[in-house]
Interface confidence: medium
């Protein structure tokens, strides 16, 4: 790669902080580590110094030059669970409706279905920032050394955590946004009209419900730390901006921040769902709720999380990313052959 | 399992008032269900006199607004009904029957559930 | 006050056969904003207290033969028995939930031929 030329010196390639976003467990130190945050991380930040020539750049490269690489793999499974959640929403509240009882529904779906299918996609590309992380620490426990190469698959997953996180990020802001202009809607004035009309014909003067209250106000106040949060792992993630934190105020906001934000975001829609997990009413055509699918993976990645935290195994993964190995799950011919 | 249970005098003498207690068992009236009074005089049919909502309010039948009153004792998870100047047209059977409460998607809900009825007859 | 009209009065329809119920509305008993109608389908039989059939003049109450069907919308609505069997034989009452005073129609009685 022609950046190469831009560092001479190798000493300067260890001084550079390699940029393995929204989440940073040192996954990455093992068998290669230390020679893997060289040959991938950094080559993204050297990148950066390799356009002085760029509007220069040969019409023959300009093809074979991919257009954003890191981001075809979050963007096509952002895209997938989109999909797949936007399909099965509308299946819930517009064919359901329509097939049962005659009603036409569609309206619902520029804002009610499409502000469903954002704050799925954007919980489960949370929870894909740090399942390959749960997933490493796994591996390295089972293999018992840190000098073993990860599947190419999960090698490629770390490498796009900064991407997922990203985009989980963009879906948040999105859900946020399209959540705000529920009461600018006609349809929500219309049916407000139409609910204070009802409260007049059963003499009701007062239509608080206590538990409805407080359920809103929490899930909407995690839902917006959770955002605020979010926010700040984004900004952090800016070159700029992470280039002026040392590795360890980078790793721990990255790290311990990002699981915070998960967290928020479950219990966002736990509280969301409140009362409703017992409600079969929910259950169209026998399907569970969108909330009931999205908070899944999340509380997967949670609790994994929060056994891997357990002192016991948090030690033995210190001891493994620190260079310690379980003799008794090493194949002493495979070391030999590695070195 | 829900029961609804209607009580109260089965003679009623003219210009008296009928009183009338449903007592719920299994549920409480308190929540989730609205309770109704509905009336059938012999051979004719079905009318609608007045409902309590889960809060305690109420509505009547214009047509017998002016004579009904409906009540609650929540200790007793019960609630009744109260009809002033009785005549003779007021004879009928006289049902209890719940609905889901008023939400805000779906507003109102059919009657799923009625007592077996109770013969009121208005007679000197 | 919403006048449920029913018609006919009464009905005679052999066993297996179907039968039909008609039910109008003085004035439409379909809220646009959520799409349904508050109409409802009872079932009464002689000494008994009337029992819920169908609700928001489509959805079968659980516990409801498929043999019975509602349809309809606005303001006019039919109760369909598919197969009519001897235990069908009741009077059958719509009533609307669109408005208070909840208001209930004529009824019709169905009586096997």
């Known amino acids: 790669m022609e950046s190469r030329k831009d560092i001479t010196n190798q000493e300067e390639l260890w001084k550079m902080k390699p940029r393995r976003n929204l989440e940073e467990d040192d996954y990455l130190h093992k068998d290669t580590g230390e020679t893997s945050m060289l040959k991938r991380p950094v080559l993204l930040h050297l990148h950066q110094t390799a356009h002085a020539d760029e509007f220069d750049c040969p019409s023959e490269l300009q093809h074979t030059q991919e257009l954003f690489p890191q981001w075809h793999l979050p963007i096509k499974i952002a895209a997938i669970i989109a999909s797949l959640t936007f399909l099965y929403t509308l299946l819930r509240e517009v064919i359901h409706p329509l097939a049962t009882s005659h009603q036409q529904y569609f309206y619902k779906i520029p804002i009610l279905v499409i502000n469903k299918v954002l704050p799925m996609v954007s919980i489960t590309l949370l929870a894909l920032v740090y399942l390959p992380g749960v997933i490493a620490a796994i591996v390295q426990l089972h293999n018992g050394t840190k000098y073993k190469k990860f599947p190419h698959w999960l090698d490629k997953w770390m490498l796009t955590r900064k991407q997922f996180g990203l985009l989980s990020f963009f879906f948040a802001v999105l859900h946020a946004i399209y959540s705000l202009s529920y009461p600018m809607r006609r349809s929500y004035r219309y049916k407000l009209l139409n609910w204070a009309y009802q409260q007049v014909q059963q003499n009701k003067e007062d239509a608080w419900i206590e538990h409805d209250v407080w359920r809103m106000e929490i899930y909407v106040s995690l839902g917006i730390v959770g955002l605020a949060i979010l926010a700040l792992l984004a900004v952090t993630s800016i070159p700029s901006v992470s280039d002026s934190l040392t590795w360890r105020e980078f790793h721990y906001i990255q790290s311990k921040l990002g699981i915070v934000s998960l967290l928020l975001g479950t219990i966002h829609a736990l509280i969301f769902a409140w009362n409703k997990w017992i409600d079969i009413k929910q259950f169209v055509w026998y399907t569970p709720p969108t909330f009931m699918i999205a908070v899944f993976l999340p509380i997967v990645v949670l609790i994994f999380k929060s056994i891997l935290f357990l002192p016991c195994l948090r030690k033995k993964i210190l001891k493994i990313r620190h260079g310690w190995e379980d003799v008794t799950k090493i194949n002493k011919t495979e070391i030999c052959s590695q070195l | 399992q829900v029961q609804v249970q209607e009580s109260g005098p089965g003679l009623v003498k003219p210009s008296q008032t009928l009183s009338l207690t449903c007592t719920v068992s299994g549920y409480s009236i308190t929540s989730d269900y609205s309770w109704n009074w509905i009336r059938q005089p012999p051979g004719k049919k079905l009318e609608w006199i007045g409902y309590?909502?889960?809060?305690?309010?109420?509505v009547y039948n214009p047509s017998l607004k002016s004579r009904v009153t409906i009540s609650r004792d929540t200790s007793k998870n019960q609630f009744s009904l109260k009809l002033s100047s009785v005549t003779a047209a007021d004879t009928a059977v006289y049902y209890c029957?719940?609905?889901?409460?008023?939400?805000?998607?779906?507003?109102?809900?059919?009657?799923?559930?009625w007592g077996q009825g109770t013969l009121v007859t208005v007679s000197s | 006050d919403i006048v449920m009209t029913q018609s006919p009065d009464s009905l005679a329809v052999s066993l297996g056969e179907r039968a039909t119920i008609n039910c109008k509305s003085s004035?439409?008993?379909?809220?646009?904003?959520?799409?349904?109608?508050?109409l409802a389908w009872y079932q009464q039989k002689p000494g008994q207290p009337p029992k819920l059939l169908i609700y928001w003049a489509y959805t079968r109450e659980s516990g409801v033969p498929d043999r019975f069907s509602g349809s309809g919308s606005g303001t006019d609505f039919t109760l369909t028995i598919s197969s009519l069997q001897a235990e069908d034989v009741a009077v059958y009452y719509c009533?609307?939930?669109?408005?208070?005073?909840?208001?209930f129609g004529g009824g019709t009685k169905v009586e096997i031929k």
């Open positions: 009533q609307q939930y669109y408005k208070y005073p909840r208001t």
């Open positions: 029957a719940r609905e889901r409460n008023y939400d805000y998607e779906l507003y109102y809900y059919a009657m799923d559930y």
């Open positions: 309590i909502g889960e809060s305690g309010s109420t």
């Open positions: 004035q439409t008993l379909l809220y646009r904003s959520n799409q349904k109608n508050y």
